[in-house]
Interface confidence: low
């Protein structure tokens, strides 16, 4: 048995005579067989949950569910339980009913076994019938909303006459109808204005009815109607077996160049039309259990239950429904050298579903890991600058397909024919697994004898210690100029433009620092600033060359305060800016600046 | 019979708004989910949004994320697309549509459209 | 989201030829596919749905086929009245997408 509501609400007013009806509250069936009997708790409750004082006052018919007054509430026991309302006014009293059998005690109140009846209290005697607008001669003031279990019996879930107006107003007409669709299962029976569903209801079919409850009003020569929400929630149990959308049991996945620990290998939808068990008790009550395979295959992998509500069509409404998603992860990173190929089974359980048929489907994983090879181009050929400052970067050698890598750790080394023209340096980028070649030792650099440059390029994988190799040829073009004096470490030092382009930088490749223009759109991305190279900096990432030295790049880099009008990088740099963003590394300082309008003009005059 | 019919086109500014209603009549309007569609001139069909039967389940397609908003008032039989910020990428004959209570997210009724065209 | 392509963009065609339009997904979508006819300044009209269903009322010379991926519309004696551009609509998942169109002209 349950009630088809959590709540009931009435008014009650000082001196109503004992014996005046107040309401009826209903239960449902969960069985044919059930019958259900009600039963009041002792208590009138008051503001937050205070228990006010031992319920004298009302009763209940055990087998209808009538609420009466038993005896009149007049002034002083008003007053008295007012008193106890820890200094609140008592404008609401509420008591608690249960159904009987029920284990539940008196300080608990959870639906479906026990429901909560609100009285708004009046300390006033209820009013003259004439005074009753229609409003109140139809509906309780809160408007009513009702919850009714799938699958199970019909029955009478609501009353609509208000039983203190229809008891101490009898010459006010109140007729009750309800609009509805067409071939909707409720009713309301004319003579006892009972509501009830004509047949057990299908959640999976609709889910809410937004029915309306329309009263019309005879009071004498004037007929008024009033319409209000008559809203009823179905509530699901788990009669939906789980099934395959469109039929897909089998996925299939090639693990190759994503080789990462936790990297998804492949997913499987189920469906079920259901929404329990609710999300709490899901993952323990709809398991996903990896089948033994070989010791390899369960170490290798596990499959991770992702549960998400969605809706579904039904006879042009929405209904919500469960998909749950199977995913295949990996339990660890992969070496390269790994090669098989397997079925993996996943055996999912609906342990709440009671049939007819199974909860039960078997998901199929065919799976092939590959083996990776390292390959390099066979040579490189780039150029360098004479002019380029230390830590410039000059390109990347990359391992084939090394920017889809993940999981796979390769390092590269430089070893250099000349040993004294050993100019660069290579240091692998942790992003994609390409190695970043810069520029090292500008003295080196320098020296006329070093105008070509060989070096052999090195790609090992950390794990298996399998290794690629390439040429790399670096031509050194141009001719050194020395900086002029006073110019800072850090191109972003400089604010304006024409000290920004007359300085070098370190990281900067030409020797010259870079001006990046901004676009003048309050605070951006696009910020005006100095920089050793706008290819590499800022770009919103501190990379693994920018890291050596905070010089080089302190927009993406800085770990310090930024002054002025910013978005902070994550989780350093300057993500936006306002205007010029400057920076000062050795003060772990940078500041984003209106642009200055009258830089131009000025610098022209003071040449 | 069904009959859907579309009203609140013209000529809309760049980054200004506009409101398109759709009337339905001749089925029970609160018991299906309604769509708007759109088609630019010459160009072929776009789902802009969705909206359930009760207005419980709203979805807007990425590209008005954030500046259309679907509604419904099941009272006066009506869908609503509200459409702020536009853009001439929003130029397009606007289309309602009823969803088939067969096969749920099939159109089985269009209106005739009401076209928009922003430009300043 | 699920990408749709139609082809062939545009076919000419005579009175009483048979047809074959062509659609396909992205990614697997069931049988969770519809076919629209629209004319000139017309809205579109449902054909079929569920990959292979007659839509109620529409004639017999058009049929729907495939599943998963790969998806046909075949008119089986082209009439006058069927001069047309055809679309194919996924219904398997939101954003709800169309194919580009076949427009069917007279030869």
């Known amino acids: 048995l349950y009630f088809s509501r959590d709540a009931y609400w009435e008014k009650l007013y000082v001196d109503q005579a004992a014996g005046t009806p107040l309401l009826y509250v209903h239960a449902l069936r969960d069985a044919p067989e059930e019958v259900p009997s009600f039963r009041l708790g002792q208590h009138l409750y008051g503001t937050y949950r205070t228990r006010l004082h031992e319920n004298n006052w009302i009763c209940i018919q055990e087998d209808t569910g009538l609420l009466y007054l038993n005896r009149s509430l007049d002034h002083s026991s008003w007053e008295k339980l007012s008193v106890r309302n820890r200094g609140f006014p008592l404008l609401t009293v509420y008591l608690k009913v249960f159904l009987s059998p029920t284990s539940l005690r008196e300080g608990e109140c959870q639906w479906p076994g026990c429901a909560r009846v609100y009285f708004s209290f009046f300390n006033t005697s209820f009013p003259a019938c004439s005074s009753l607008k229609p409003r109140e001669l139809c509906f309780p003031e809160t408007r009513p909303s009702f919850r009714i279990r799938e699958n199970r019996p019909p029955g009478t879930f609501h009353q609509f006459r208000l039983l203190p107006v229809q008891f101490l107003c009898p010459n006010i007409s109140v007729a009750y109808r309800l609009l509805e669709g067409e071939g909707l299962p409720f009713r309301c029976a004319p003579d006892s204005l009972e509501v009830s569903t004509r047949w057990a209801l299908d959640r999976e079919q609709r889910e809410k009815y937004e029915l309306v409850a329309v009263c019309t009003v005879h009071a004498g020569a004037r007929e008024e109607v009033v319409m209000v929400p008559f809203p009823v929630t179905v509530y699901d149990e788990d009669d939906s077996a789980p099934t395959f959308p469109a039929g897909v049991d089998t996925a299939s996945a090639v693990v190759e160049f994503k080789r990462k620990e936790d990297t998804v290998v492949a997913t499987l939808r189920v469906f079920d039309a259901d929404v329990v068990p609710a999300s709490g008790e899901l993952v323990r009550r709809y398991t996903s259990t990896l089948l033994p395979g070989d010791t390899w295959a369960q170490q290798t992998f596990r499959v991770e239950h992702w549960p998400n509500e969605t809706s579904v069509q039904a006879n042009g409404s929405f209904v919500r429904a469960t998909v749950h998603d199977y995913r295949l992860v990996l339990n660890r990173n992969l070496s390269i050298s790994e090669n098989r190929t397997m079925q993996l089974a996943v055996l999912v359980n609906d342990s709440d579903f009671q049939g007819p048929g199974a909860g039960v489907l078997l998901l199929h994983f065919n799976v092939s890991v590959l083996p990776v090879s390292l390959h390099l181009p066979s040579t490189y050929s780039l150029s360098v600058s004479r002019r380029a400052r230390r830590f410039a970067q000059i390109g990347k050698v990359c391992v084939e397909n090394c920017q889809a890598f993940s999981g796979i750790n390769v390092q590269y080394k430089l070893h250099s024919s000349g040993a004294n023209c050993s100019t660069l340096g290579v240091v692998t980028s942790a992003e994609d697994t390409s190695g970043i070649l810069f520029v090292n030792d500008t003295k080196a650099l320098r020296r006329p004898k070093c105008a070509e440059l060989h070096y052999m390029v090195v790609a090992t994988d950390q794990q298996t210690s399998r290794q690629a190799q390439a040429q790399l040829l670096v031509t050194v073009e141009g001719s050194y100029v020395a900086e002029e004096a006073g110019c800072p470490l850090s191109c972003a030092v400089s604010k304006r433009r024409l000290e920004c382009e007359e300085c070098g930088g370190l990281g900067s490749p030409t020797g010259r620092c870079e001006w990046r223009q901004g676009d003048g759109k309050g605070i951006t991305r696009n910020f005006s600033t100095c920089s050793p190279s706008t290819k590499t900096c800022p770009d919103g990432h501190c990379d693994v060359v920018e890291t050596q030295d905070i010089n080089i790049c302190p927009q993406d880099c800085l770990r310090g305060s930024i002054v002025g009008g910013h978005e902070p990088g994550e989780p350093r740099g300057i993500k936006a800016g306002y205007g010029t963003c400057n920076c000062f590394p050795e003060e772990e300082k940078c500041f984003c600046e209106p642009e200055d309008i009258q830089d131009p003009l000025c610098d022209e005059l003071c040449r | 019979q069904v009959q859907l019919v579309e009203s609140g086109g013209g000529v809309g500014q760049p980054g200004r708004s506009l409101r398109l209603s759709c009337v339905a009549s001749g089925f029970t309007f609160r018991n299906y989910g309604m769509h708007w569609v759109r088609q630019a001139p010459g160009k072929g069909l776009d789902w802009v949004a969705i909206?359930?039967?009760?207005?419980?389940?709203?979805y807007n397609v990425d590209s008005v994320k954030g500046r259309f908003t679907i509604s419904r008032d099941n009272s006066k039989n009506t869908l609503y697309l509200q459409m702020n910020s536009l853009g001439a990428e929003d130029t397009a004959i606007y289309y309602c549509?009823?969803?088939?209570?067969?096969?749920?997210?099939?159109?089985?009724?269009w209106g005739q459209g009401t076209l928009v065209t922003v430009s300043s | 989201d699920i990408q749709m392509t139609q082809s062939p963009p545009s076919l000419s065609a005579s009175v009483g030829d048979r047809v074959t339009i062509t659609c396909r997904a992205s990614?697997?979508?069931?049988?969770?596919l519809n076919w629209y006819q629209q004319k000139p300044g017309k809205a579109p009209k449902i054909l079929i749905y569920?990959?292979?269903r007659l839509q109620s009322g529409v004639p017999s010379r058009f049929s729907g086929s495939g599943s998963g991926t790969d998806f046909t519309l075949t008119i089986s004696s082209l009439q006058p009245e069927d001069f047309a551009t055809y679309y194919c609509q996924q219904s398997y998942s939101t954003p709800l997408t169309f194919g580009g169109g076949t427009k069917v002209e007279i030869k």
């Open positions: 990614q697997s979508i069931g049988n969770y």
């Open positions: 909206i359930g039967y009760d207005g419980s389940k709203e």
């Open positions: 549509a009823r969803e088939s209570p067969i096969t749920g997210t099939t159109f089985d009724y």
């Open positions: 569920a990959a292979s």
